[in-house]
């Protein structure tokens, strides 16, 4: 390649490479919840299971305990889908009443904790107003978007009503991250 | 590893490098459908343009009769968005006369075909229930996750109620996949 | 290699490596919006935070102005949520009064402006009827795909609406774009 | 309520091994990360490093790796500190702390002295 | 090591005085925390994140400040505040502390 130069320096490498399929991964399926205690004012978090049908965790990402651990630091794309189901919300009947009612509501947040910060984070939010007309109701709420973690992080999802999610199908709630 | 730091390992490599540019992807957008037969009980799949306008696909990922063909194993990341548009959902009117109704719904589907297991997999489902009060309506339902998937896997959507599906713009219903 | 054919395998490479850590990435939070002007028949963009909180810009991707620029070709994932939120809409009011009635809607778009082509293209779009029984709704509209962009194109979010745009909280609404 | 609770003996001979447990109650001590810091008499405070409980992933100060230990045992809701090969400079006010979950919470502190 | 340098390390004002206390990072931080630590007692966390006042303290205490140069002040002395107060950064390892301002009535 004589007198070639090298072309654009987007091409340079300024950071060690690495294989794609080294790096941290996991999805996470829904499964039946258990009542947990959990903090007043604080949405319940969601468990998980992490191997058994289309759920896995790869390449020293973990799960326990309810928690993604994050084993590198990095960009990493993290996503959620969960699907909520219920009977009438009363905000309809109170509507048929003739009064105006603030309507029940479904809320699903990406949370993260990390040890370089006193307060859990909210990556993302996805909350939804419920006045349903119809006696049963069903939805999903879908989350998805890129942040910048640090070794030792830990993910996971809030529900603002763990009793709503349905738990019935791996492919109607889930969980998962990738570094990018 | 019990107390172990994380170690450095990720600058290692385990694996082939590849260059980025080179991996299997596609964004595929909608088409008007034309009414095909399909089984009873299965949501019949849509069809897709890979070429023009938007859509593309790329480094051996091909798109044929509905299907995207998976040309290399690895983990993908999946997404879908259907809008779906229709009239108002009988749901309301048996509602308003004092009827109460399991209500309408539109689904769509993810789902994997492969060689290796005799019935098609959903990888990603979103359903919602459709009680509209307005007489026209219309929505989007959006799916994206990451799956590990095996070389000669078939990928394609599914959904409820094909004669629903708001084939106007390529911005409003559309289906990809990318090698991560 | 001398008589040796080349292989079929992936793991050729066939374009530069490049480290992921050096890629152009970002993620924009929401920030409250200033009435703007905007062509008639044209949906307002919205702008947006790139640096305090979530929010960061990385590797040449910069945001100025409402865009998000893009400095370098190749397959971007670009993704956006808007939680939209408002008093009843009139359909449902209309519709109390017996007349069937358009509804509402709430829109986003993700739209591409690029030198070689006169017109905005419209990525990504989210578009849903808004005909709510209570009194204060809120929801969000999610979005995410790949496409091909080139060195110099430029990226916005518009709405239909840019008053009911949830500008409270940065997990709410946001947009966010890498190379992938 | 939350509570941290220091325990271990306030007295330690040079050369051996300081052990400390805290036992945590009110909240679960696995959606947090635990720390140890030290303050020596009529110094500043000095952080010595942190366990998350949930997967016994461990950072330590680097001043002070090749000498302390931090572990758990979720069925207790402990976390123990071992620091080897003590000195008189080790003689401090050894305080539990949670971290990762509003309040942060501290122990009320142990006293250890490293005495002959 | 990120080191914090804190100043002053005491001061006395009076009571109803405002009071300032610096701290410098040697390199850039996104966060710092400030502690109270009275005589006999564990450090209490008055602010974290920089700017944000920790469940139940008073509104007279405050923190501001990004990159390395961080404020910590007391709009009003009150007799309660006499006591130790402390900047920390918890990013790079090891995580580190300011060496204290012991603050007086005078």
């Known amino acids: 390649l004589k007198g070639q130069e090298f072309a654009p320096s987007h091409q340079q490498v300024y950071a060690p490479l690495r294989a794609d399929g080294d790096k941290p991964r996991a999805h996470l399926t829904v499964v039946r919840q258990t009542p947990t205690q959990h903090f007043k004012n604080q949405f319940p978090a969601l468990h998980w299971e992490h191997e058994l049908g289309l759920a896995f965790t790869k390449n020293r990402m973990n799960y326990t305990n309810k928690f993604l651990l994050i084993p590198e630091s990095g960009d990493y794309f993290i996503y959620s889908q969960v699907t909520f189901r219920g009977m009438t919300s009363e905000c309809s009947e109170i509507r048929q009443a003739g009064r105006p009612n603030k309507p029940d509501s479904i809320t699903v947040v990406i949370t993260k904790v990390t040890d370089s910060y006193p307060e859990p984070t909210q990556l993302l939010m996805g909350t939804k107003s419920v006045c349903e007309v119809g006696s049963n109701w069903f939805q999903p709420i879908y989350l998805g978007a890129m942040f910048s973690l640090q070794e030792g992080d830990k993910l996971m999802v809030n529900v603002s009503d763990i009793s709503l999610v349905d738990y019935t199908k791996e492919d109607k709630t889930f969980f998962g991250a990738f570094l990018l | 590893l019990k107390g172990q730091e994380f170690a450095p390992s990720h600058q290692q490599v385990y694996a082939p490098l590849r260059a980025d540019g080179d991996k299997p992807r596609a964004h595929l957008t909608v088409v008007r459908q034309t009414p095909t037969q399909h089984f009873k009980n299965q949501f019949p799949a849509l069809h897709w343009e890979h070429e023009l306008g938007l859509a593309f696909t790329k480094n051996r990922m091909n798109y044929t009769n509905k299907f995207l063909l998976i040309p290399e194993s690895g983990d993908y990341f999946i997404y879908s968005q259907v809008t779906f548009r229709g009239m108002t959902s009988e749901c309301s009117e048996i509602r308003q006369a004092g009827r109460p109704n399991k209500p309408d719904s539109i689904t769509v589907v993810i789902t994997k075909v492969t060689d290796s297991y005799p019935e098609p997999t959903q990888l990603l489902m979103g359903t919602k229930s459709v009680c509209e009060v307005g007489s026209n309506w219309f929505q989007p339902i959006y799916l994206g996750a990451m799956f590990s998937l095996q070389e000669g896997d078939k990928l394609m959507v599914n959904v409820s109620d094909i004669s629903l599906v708001d084939y106007t713009k390529e911005d409003k219903t559309f289906f990809g996949a990318f090698l991560l | 290699l001398k008589g040796q054919e080349f292989a079929p395998s992936h793991q050729q490479v066939y374009a530069p490596l490049r480290a992921d850590g050096d890629k152009p990435r970002a993620h924009l939070t929401v920030v409250r919006q200033t009435p703007t002007q905007h062509f008639k028949n044209q949906f307002p963009a919205l702008h947006w935070e790139h640096e305090l909180g979530l929010a960061f810009t990385k590797n040449r991707m910069n945001y100025t102005n409402k865009f998000l620029l893009i400095p370098e070709s190749g397959d971007y994932f670009i993704y956006s949520q808007v939680t939209f939120r408002g008093m009843t809409s009139e359909c449902s009011e209309i519709r109390q009064a017996g007349r069937p009635n358009k509804p509402d809607s709430i829109t986003v778009v993700i739209t591409k402006v690029t030198d070689s082509y006169p017109e905005p293209t419209q990525l990504l779009m989210g578009t849903k009827s808004v005909c709510e029984v209570g009194s204060n709704w809120f929801q969000p509209i999610y979005l995410g795909a790949m496409f091909s962009l080139q060195e110099g194109d430029k990226l916005m979010v518009n709405v239909s609406d840019i008053s009911l745009v949830d500008y409270t909280k940065e997990d709410k609404t946001f947009f966010g774009a890498f190379l992938l | 309520q939350v509570q941290l609770q220091e325990s271990g003996p306030g007295l330690v001979r040079p050369s051996q091994t300081l052990s400390l447990t805290c036992t945590v109650s009110g909240f679960d001590f696995q959606d947090t990360y635990m720390h140890w810091v030290r303050q020596r008499p009529g110094r500043g405070l000095e952080w010595m490093g942190r366990?998350?409980?949930?997967?016994?992933?461990?950072k330590y100060n680097p001043s002070l790796k090749s000498r302390v230990t931090i572990t758990r045992d979720t069925s207790k809701n402990q976390v123990s500190l071992r620091l080897s090969s003590v000195t008189a400079a080790d003689t401090a006010v050894y305080y539990c702390?949670?971290?990762?979950?509003?309040?942060?919470?501290w122990g009320q502190g142990s006293l250890v002295t490293v005495s002959s | 090591d990120i080191q914090m340098t804190q100043s002053p390390s005491s001061l006395s004002a009076s009571v109803g005085d405002r009071v300032t206390i610096t701290c410098r990072a040697s390199?850039?931080?996104?966060?710092m925390y400030w502690y109270q630590q009275k005589p006999g007692k564990a450090p209490k966390l008055l602010i974290y994140g920089a700017s944000n006042l920790a469940s139940g303290v008073p509104s007279r205490f405050s923190g501001s400040g990004s990159g390395t140069d961080f404020t910590f002040t007391i709009s009003s002395l009150q007799p309660e505040d006499i006591a130790t107060y402390y900047c920390q950064q918890w990013e790079g390892n090891p995580r580190t502390f300011g060496q204290g301002t012991k603050v007086e009535i005078k």
């Open positions: 702390v949670r971290s990762g979950g509003l309040p942060d919470v």
């Open positions: 390199s850039s931080v996104s966060y």
């Open positions: 366990i998350d409980p949930a997967s016994e992933h461990t």
